[in-house]
């Protein structure tokens, strides 16, 4: 004969555990039903009655099958430097991630606790390592033969154009200006493995940035002044 299907609540066999989506109630000493995601236990089970579940209230949630007396509160609304990538529902918490141009300086279990603006490399510097969701940009000086004329969190140093006749030689922050009609971007011959950067360490100090182009992160993070080479990269 097939074994009888026990309906909750029921007393488990000695040494056995309750089934999936059930829990053992110590007070009733019975296997009782869990509440589904989006619900919580309004009334706990007894020896004769099963768990009574109720829906989570607004701004609260439960993500798992549970027997909690109250639903969890959703996290606070996303800040201005964040975007809501998952809304608060009865079954899931709100998730905030950093908006484009920002990275997560302090993460939490899901989403981000503190966003910081991606560093912008000033002219004469390029992006050695790009920023990611959880890491800042790393800037380094442009090597001879390359330049960056932008203040940017994405631009690398690019090769100077090769001129038939040079009107103005290029430097770390400016492309070469040609007088001929057909400049080319192809590299000059030679086997230079690594051009030497033009700057020295003392030139790394970033001038006080305009807030619109390169906001400082020093008020957000435990670090000193903000030279362009700063940044740790990683996920």
């Amino acid at each position: 004969l097939p074994a009888q299907v026990a309906f909750t609540p029921y007393a488990p066999e000695p040494g056995s555990t309750c089934r999936l989506r059930e829990y053992y109630d110590q007070t009733a000493q019975m296997c009782c039903s869990k509440c589904s995601p989006g619900q919580h236990a309004k009334v706990f089970c007894t020896k004769t009655s099963d768990t009574v579940c109720d829906s989570c209230e607004d701004s609260t949630y439960t993500q798992l099958w549970n027997w909690v007396p109250e639903c969890l509160s959703c996290g606070s609304r996303c800040s201005s430097d964040q975007v809501e990538t998952q809304a608060c529902t009865r079954e899931q918490n709100r998730i905030c991630t950093c908006r484009p141009g920002w990275y997560c300086a302090l993460s939490k279990q899901e989403g981000c606790r503190l966003c910081a603006p991606l560093r912008k490399c000033r002219p004469g510097f390029g992006v050695a390592r790009p920023g990611t969701e959880t890491s800042d940009v790393v800037c380094k000086p442009c090597a001879p033969g390359t330049f960056s004329n932008t203040t940017s969190s994405t631009d690398i140093c690019r090769p100077h154009q090769i001129c038939n006749v040079v009107a103005i030689p290029g430097n770390a922050s400016m492309d070469a200006v040609c007088t001929s009609t057909s400049p080319t971007r192809s590299m000059a011959p030679g086997a230079v493995h690594l051009p030497q950067p033009v700057s020295t360490r003392s030139q790394h100090t970033q001038p006080t940035p305009e807030p619109s182009t390169a906001p400082s992160t020093s008020f957000l993070l435990p670090m000193g002044p903000s030279p362009p080479a700063e940044g740790s990269t990683g996920d």
Partner: antibody
């Protein structure tokens, strides 16, 4: 011209620690990120991590994170990679590579062969 | 982790001919792909960075193209010194990952 010169070959026993150096000459180490890359015999390249010598900040690949430490001494323009709890599968050539503002690993050391054998 | 898949594993081409090497990323990596050449017993050296920019001193016969998930390294007229292993590498997200390599051999 900037050059990266690494320390010589090493033979280690399982469980030991190896520390390889990478001397940057021709220019300041602070103008580059220094990466370390592993190449096992007959295999491809595997990124281990990097250091920004100017900041002392590091980033490690998850595979190596628990066993690798990358440091840099700006006074001697030298970067170091220390790999602990060595096992036979760590037998490989280890390269340091410099990363400038072009965003690429544009200069490499000659490589250091580490042999792990009991 | 982003997986970089190179094809073919081995490519046999005659000197003077054109070689086309492929690299596919498992996720969108934008233009954050570099190409490296490695000869036996030597260190890798960069040929192309940011998918299409030829590195200083690299001959014009080397060119790179592609963005997103599909990238190509083309060597227009193969020279004897071009026979080597070629690796692509993505630096869009961590960990930085390399392709398994394409061995370019003389036909």
């Amino acid at each position: 011209e900037v050059q990266l010169v690494q320390s010589g070959a090493e033979v280690k026993k399982p469980g030991a620690t190896v520390k390889i150096s990478c001397k940057v000459s021709g220019y300041s180490i602070t103008d580059y990120l220094l990466h370390w890359v592993q190449q096992a015999p007959g295999k491809g390249l595997e990124w281990m991590g990097w250091i920004d010598p100017e900041e002392g900040k590091t980033k490690y690949g998850q595979k190596f994170q628990s066993r690798v430490t990358i440091t840099a001494d700006t006074s001697t323009d030298t970067a170091y990679m220390e790999l602990s709890s060595l096992r036979s599968e760590d037998t490989a050539v280890y390269y340091c590579a410099a990363n400038s503002a072009t965003g690429t690993m544009d200069a490499w050391g000659q490589g250091t062969l580490v042999t792990v054998s009991s | 982790d982003i997986v970089m898949t190179q094809s073919p594993a081995t490519l046999s081409v005659s000197p003077g001919e054109r070689a086309t090497l492929s690299c596919k990323a498992s996720q969108n990596v934008g233009s954050n792909v570099d190409w490296y050449q490695q000869k036996p017993g030597q260190s890798p050296r960069v040929l192309i960075y940011k998918a299409s920019i030829r590195y200083t001193g690299i001959p014009a016969r080397f060119s790179g193209s592609g963005s997103g998930t599909e990238f190509t390294l083309t060597i227009s007229i193969l020279q004897s010194e071009d026979f080597a292993v070629y690796f692509c590498m993505q630096s869009k997200s961590y960990p930085i990952t390399f392709g398994q390599g394409t061995k370019l051999e003389i036909k």
